[in-house]
Amino acid sequence: YGSGSKLKVPELSLKGTQHVMQAGQTLFLKCRGEAAHSWSLPTTVSQEDKRLSITPPSACGRDNRQFCSTLTLDTAQANHTGLYTCRYLPTSTSKKKKAESSIYIFVSDAGSPFIEMHTDIPKLVHMTEGRQLIIPCRVTSPNVTVTLKKFPFDTLTPDGQRITWDSRRGFIIANATYKEIGLLNCEATVNGHLYQTNYLTHRQTNTILDVQIRPPSPVRLLHGQTLVLNCTATTELNTRVQMSWNYPGKATKRASIRQRIDRSHSHNNVFHSVLKINNVESRDKGLYTCRVKSGSSFQSFNTSVHVYEKGFISVKHRKQPVQETTAGRRSYRLSMKVKAFPSPEIVWLKDGSPATLKSARYLVHGYSLIIKDVTTEDAGDYTILLGIKQSRLFKNLTATLIVNVKPQIYEKSVSSLPSPPLYPLGSRQVLTCTVYGIPRPTITWLWHPCHHNHSKERYDFCTENEESFILDPSSNLGNRIESISQRMTVIEGTNKTVSTLVVADSQTPGIYSCRAFNKIGTVERNIKFYVTDVPNGFHVSLEKMPAEGEDLKLSCVVNKFLYRDITWILLRTVNNRTMHHSISKQKMATTQDYSITLNLVIKNVSLEDSGTYACRARNIYTGEDILRKTEVLVRDSEAPHLLQNLSDYEVSISGSTTLDCQARGVPAPQITWFKNNHKIQQEPGIILGPGNSTLFIERVTEEDEGVYRCRATNQKGAVESAAYLTVQGTSDKSNLE
């Protein structure tokens, strides 16, 4: 490498991860790096060994900017086999965690295939079931074939998974079981010679599962009381433990300690060590440690002990003296900051009475009062009473709880009608919202207009999403407002605000909203203000009962905000079942400002057209079909007849006279008048009365004398009557004749 190249890790002269050399040869290793470095050697190589020499790092490389060091081991032996490492010194500028290079050197010796030989006395290897177990029969050459055997006859064959062979470490058993407990040996045959090194596995049944001290820390006592601490150690089945205590008075043996074993658990041991000090004093305060040892396992548990000369109580507000919550909350915790010893008796008062007696919803938890399912009844003054009778200590502290309520509009909770009410056109209307909330809500009225559009069948675009306007009594939006007022009233024992909007003249459809808000929330009630020019929003009319051959004229008018799909149907009863027959040739419905009109005209009716006619419309809000019925009875035709025949009549000249021709018939007969066989037309001085049934002649002249005939006619026939009208006081000429 040139001096320009940075060596992140030191570089060794021997490349690769391992190197095999023969025993008796000299090991020569050079390390080059960017900084000062040191060597780490196998435990079997002593730094004092005269055969070992290490030169301290000195400048080397191009421009002498690098550091080099050499390690020389003369006449290397089998037990010098191991890992040789060159690493940067931690004080150097290199911040790398693993700024080191290593090589594993095998010093091969045919006479010593194993680095360590245990022939007569097996080496003790501790094992824990379920954990990794290493039988450390490391070898001096990676080429040595080693077999693992268990006394007397078993061979443990490496499978690459549970049991593996590593020439640097030995046999690795991934999760040891009790089957590996006993005498194991590693065997290697080199040049026909069998070498054996022996290991005795010893199962460490020293699993400490848990250590606890009761009572839990911290332990508080008054001067003169007795301290009892129970330390429990839970272990696996065949595990022994040694339990000891460290505590402030240990030197003077202040405590008595007794031990016992709880054998009530089938799967483990529970060892108890109970420390007891009678009449504790200040010197007994401090840290108490229970120490549990089992083989190489060790666990400890601490607890702190406080000794007080006398009892005390200190109480403060944890939050503000005045606290707020909201009705409907699942729970609210009123909490005080209390420091006291010994534990005081606690009583909570609400408005001077014991809280827990007032309601089962009040629960005392430590120095807190928990209020379940908060209601307005929970507002009030809460006092915590704390007392330590034996010390004659008593303290109390009061907090005020305000229970806020989100606004509620009572008219919303009353089951509303399935479809909105209709307001008669031009009527005066009083709209009311009754509101409750804490703090007292502010109420505003709003108007959402419906945009007028006659081409629409109804105002289905008139929704709450429309732009809204805040109203005041002088507003000219929508309908003329007479007043907006508010008054307080007590309903069911609570103060409620009644807000009233008076509409002076119902003209414009839309939506009125009353909105109530306080700091907890907002609630709104929408009042659909649908104006109607139809009584009850649905009206059916029959022009007149038709006779055979006449036209039937029916009219249906519905409020367009409430109804749609208007149609006429004829109801017929067949076998006690009412059938709905649709009527063809219906006219198109016409839409007006407030209503939809559908007229039905049936020309030239016959008797068969008699029946129950119904106008059907669908309620937009309920989806229900509404029927309004009218009975139509087509009258049978009947030839005309006169109720009274005309009779001859004398009238004075210049007088007036009336001829009456009352006829009956179905359909109603047409009356025609004749004088001397000429049809009489209405003209000045001659007036035809209603339906032509009367003939009135003003200022009679002699020309009016003659034969008058009336004829009553309908499809069934005709009838007539005649009479002679004589005019008295005519001229002489007439007399002569």
Partner: antibody, heavy 115, light 112 residues
Framework: QVQLKESGPGLVRPSETLSLTCTVS????????LSWVRRPSGKGPEWLCR???????TYNSAFKSRLTISRDTSKDQVFLKMNSLQTDDTGTYYC?????????WGQGVMVTVSS | DIVMTQTPVSMSVSLGGQVSISCRSS???????????LSWYIQKPSQSPQLLIY???NRVSGISDRFSGSGSGTDFTLKINKIEPDDLGVYYC?????????FGSGTKLEIK
């Protein structure tokens, strides 16, 4: 090599006392607990009692009044005494090393209770 | 006492086949330190019982991986794959969670 071997009479008269011995090797009674388990004919095994490694004892409450378990660690032996035997006590009696589970069992001794 | 119920009482299976033995306890076998002490044993003809599986699913060293244990709480299963002639015998489950230690009444496995 862990081994357990039970010994005792094969035939016991009703109302008499059964005495069984379990001799162990390959482990120490000071390190491991040991249990007695029996298997009545045609039934599943029944645990009788446990001798803990430290000499403590635990009995199955169903048999407690009739059982005594003890040991001689110097001889690596555990003893079971069961009194007031009835015919339904007939079965094979095993001693078993008790290390959370019964990991090693003796070959068992068949005990018949009959007059 | 915890009652251990084994099903079936006996079963006949072909060599190479697979079996499942069920064991149900009358109450949970999870102990206070979270372990479940449920074991499976085999008693081959004219032999003493031999531990196969401990703590529900841990196979004893030297036991073939054809044997597997599973389950939790109160329901446990022993599965044996690729049945061999040496597998015949009576299989027992046992609990070591609570005194008295109890066993199932056994499932006899026969080879067809």
């Amino acid at each position: 090599q862990v081994q357990l071997k039970e010994s005792g009479p094969g035939l016991v008269r009703p109302s008499e006392t059964l005495s069984l011995t379990c001799t162990v090797s390959g482990f120490s009674l000071s390190d491991y607990s040991l249990s007695w388990v029996r298997r009545p004919s045609g039934k599943g095994p029944e645990w009788l009692c446990r001798l803990w490694f430290d000499g403590d004892t635990t009995y199955n409450s169903a048999f407690k009044s009739r059982l005594t378990i003890s040991r001689d660690t110097s001889k690596d032996q555990v003893f079971l005494k069961m009194n007031s035997l009835q015919t339904d006590d007939t079965g094979t009696y095993y001693c078993t090393r008790d290390d959370r589970d019964f990991d090693y069992w003796g070959q068992g001794v068949m005990v018949t209770v009959s007059s | 006492d915890i009652v251990m119920t084994q099903t079936p009482v006996s079963m006949s299976v072909s060599l190479g086949g697979q079996v499942s033995i069920s064991c149900r306890s009358s109450q949970s076998l999870v102990n206070n330190n979270g372990n479940t002490y449920l074991s499976w044993y085999i008693q081959k003809p004219s032999q003493s019982p031999q531990l196969l599986i401990y703590k529900v699913s841990n196979r004893v060293s030297g036991i073939s991986d054809r044997f597997s244990g599973s389950g939790s709480g109160t329901d446990f299963t022993l599965k044996i794959n690729k049945i061999e002639p040496d597998d015949l015998g009576v299989y027992y489950c046992g609990q070591n969670t609570q005194y008295p230690l109890t066993f199932g009444s056994g499932t006899k496995l026969e080879i067809k």
